[in-house]
């Protein structure tokens, strides 16, 4: 009799475990659905608001010609700055012309004043050659003014109206860049 009760108890316990598993799976599935829903809603809202405002740049970004720029409010090292930009679908600022440099430095003066801002420029440790993050070379007029005395990896930053260089592991603000959305009108 006792053995029978014990067997029934074990069967009930097994059933309970299976139900808990099923509930856990359901909760996970529900969470996943909610997450997907949140994404869909966010995308719809983003699409609707950009269609309504036909804004080429996201909120808190600055537009100049075909580019949108974001000036960070936090400090980070060069590599983390790049990752922060990537999360927003952008990369660190890549300055292609003197006109773009003038726009950036002019905007920074208005926003924050004379601080250091990482850009997507770094120096090859062996050759000492400067390269933008996409592998292209900076134009001669857009090379950092001073060579950093650091034995570590060296990266480029903007300060006032100059391009300078520093150890990539120092903390600075940073500027992200992405392409502005073209208006379909």
């Amino acid at each position: 009799k006792l053995l029978q009760v014990s067997t029934i108890a074990m069967q009930q316990q097994e059933k309970l475990i299976q139900q808990e598993r099923a509930l856990l799976n359901f909760t996970e599935w529900k969470r996943s659905c909610a997450l997907q829903m949140k994404y869909c809603q966010a995308f719809m809202q983003n699409s609707l608001s950009s269609a309504h405002n036909s804004s080429p740049c996201p909120n808190n970004w600055i537009q100049n010609r075909e580019s949108c720029y974001y000036v960070s409010e936090i400090w980070s090292i060069w590599h983390t700055s790049q990752e922060n930009c990537l999360k927003e679908g952008s990369t660190l600022l890549q300055i292609e012309s003197k006109e773009e440099m003038d726009f950036i430095t002019g905007s920074l003066r208005k926003i924050k004043g004379s601080y250091d801002y990482w850009v997507g420029l770094s120096q090859d440790g062996h050759s000492g050659r400067w390269l933008w993050q996409d592998g292209s070379s900076p134009s001669p007029g857009l090379l950092p003014a001073e060579r950093s005395q650091s034995a570590n990896q060296v990266c480029g930053y903007v300060k006032s109206n100059s391009l300078l260089s520093s150890n990539c592991s120092t903390w600075k603000y940073f500027i992200c860049e992405k392409y502005a959305l073209r208006s379909s009108v």
């Epitope: 949140k38 994404y39 990537l86 679908g89 952008s90 990369t91 592998g135 860049e177 992405k178």
Partner: nanobody
Framework: QVQLQESGGGLVQSGGSLRLSCAAS????????WGWYRQAPGKQRELVAA???????AYAPSVNGRFTISRDSAKNTVYLQMNSLKPEDTAVYYC???????????????WGQGTQVTVSS
């Protein structure tokens, strides 16, 4: 959710080449940027190369000029062409997908299982 599967790793001589592939499935529409990271034994995981959904590209200074990242949107695949490989490139290479930030949600990055790349001298 987004699932990532890497392939193409292996053993190669110094100066040689390898091409890594990362096949993505799931909610790929939610991704802002695709990337490759690597982790050598006893070191932190580091960004190697990334490509945004706009096609903007970023390389780590250590691989700039040697590695090339590309993406085939139709196949939902990201590639990393690695040339002039050095022993210091030896690491496990991970595919990464960064989702669009959604207000009120803390969704982290998506990661593949990793593929081993060994460069012998």
């Amino acid at each position: 959710q987004v699932q990532l599967q890497e392939s193409g790793g292996g053993l190669v001589q110094s100066g040689g080449s390898l091409r890594l592939s990362c096949a993505a499935s799931g909610s790929v529409f939610s991704i802002n940027a695709w990337g490759w990271y690597r982790q050598a034994p006893g070191k932190q995981r580091e960004l190697v190369a990334a490509i945004t959904n706009q096609g903007r590209i970023a390389y780590a200074p250590s691989v700039n000029g040697r590695f090339t990242i590309s993406r085939d949107s139709a196949k939902n695949t990201v590639y990393l062409q690695m040339n002039s490989l050095k022993p210091e490139d030896t690491a496990v290479y991970y595919c990464n997908a960064k989702p669009t930030p959604v207000y009120g949600s803390t969704v982290g990055d998506y990661w593949g299982q990793g593929t081993q790349v060994t460069v012998s001298s």
